[in-house]
């Protein structure tokens, strides 16, 4: 009888089924929806999380201007195809044979087409801009305190290496967090910025993915930081390919 058998859950992903039938009675966890093995010592990939979510019962300006190539996830939820390592497959299709290409965070980056659509490679999202608006407070937060607290959050809660948090901008009431991670910078074992951003997004919405942890309680010098709006922009290493019709719509 081992400690694993007493508490066979996945600390980093509550959307799992776990059983103490691994070697030596160790806890082995698989993602809902896909049945894929999950490493509970780190964040689960966004693709597996989305798949699990779809399988669950339905329930002087310092601010950055997103580039013209920045993508926003306007398509909402879908049931994605994930590769054997849990990453998004470059081409996604729905039940009616409508297909499109996605980037590494699963956001559509082409017009929709049919089954003949080709997506040659999974294009990496190397820059993520998280744009937040906080609820009114007595005064503005101290920028350096806010910066330190958000960096600590990404380091400790999401296990994202500090070098990938490029900047924290603040112009009350808007906060912007810039995450940057090129293919060449991401070493084996590094948390992906797309996964960290997704966990953060779910935390901000009060839908924490962590097992048994309380919701996100963000405080800056004891003052609660309550977010009332979130927008996330995704920039890919190769610009997206949309028709002019969409761009002028």
């Amino acid at each position: 009888h081992t400690a694993a058998q007493d508490n066979c859950t996945c600390p980093t992903n509550k959307m799992t089924v776990c059983s103490p039938d691994g070697p030596g009675g160790r806890c082995q966890c698989r993602a809902l929806g896909s049945g894929m093995a999950v490493d509970c010592s780190t964040l689960t990939s966004k693709c597996l999380l989305l798949k699990a979510r779809m399988s669950a019962p339905k329930n002087a300006r310092t601010l950055v201007r997103p580039s013209e190539h920045a993508l926003v996830d306007n398509d909402g939820l879908y049931d994605p195809d994930c590769d054997p390592e849990g990453r998004f497959k470059a081409r996604q299709c729905n039940q009616t044979s409508v297909c499109w290409c996605v980037n590494s965070v699963g956001v559509r980056r082409t017009d929709k087409g049919d089954l003949s659509l080709r997506c040659d490679e999974l294009v990496r999202t190397h820059h993520i801009l998280i744009d937040l608006r906080h609820r009114p407070t007595a005064g503005a937060f101290n920028h350096s305190d806010l910066d330190a607290e958000l960096r600590r959050l990404f380091r400790e809660r999401y296990r994202l290496h500090p070098k990938f948090v490029a900047a924290v901008h603040y112009e009350q009431p808007t906060i912007q967090i810039e995450l940057r991670q090129n293919t060449s910078q991401k070493a084996a074992g590094d948390v992906d910025i797309g996964d960290a951003a997704y966990y953060f997004e779910r935390d901000i919405k009060g839908e924490s993915l962590f097992q048994g942890r309380g919701g996100l309680d963000l405080r800056v010098r004891g003052e609660p930081l309550q977010v009332e709006r979130t927008l996330i922009y995704y920039l890919d290493e190769i610009p997206p390919k949309f028709s002019m019709k969409r761009l002028t719509a």
């Epitope: 160790r26 490493d39 390592e85």
Partner: nanobody, 121 residues
Amino acid sequence: QVQLQESGGGLVQPGGSLRLSCAASGFPFSSADMSWVRQAPGKGLEWVSYINADGSKTYYPDTVKGRFTISRDNSKNTLYLQMNSLRAEDTAVYRCARAKLTDTHYVEDYWGQGTMVTVSS
């Protein structure tokens, strides 16, 4: 990138033996824990043996204990599974996998394509 290539599968009679091999590349094999897993038709993956990086620790589920033996040759970047006293219920695709074992959890993160083992008279 990580590559795992299995060989040695085939058709064998009940009570017979087979030795599977797995050639590994694209990662430091000698510092990686490894496992053999199998997938019977219409079933999920189940692990059938585990070996730590230096080969000093092995684990087996009760279903194969005493019949299967996992071993490795780090100088050849190769993992082995010796299967004796085979039964019809051992019929499955066998895949080698890179594994990770902590005090509380076990996970596989890369798998080979697999080699088919059929036990039938």
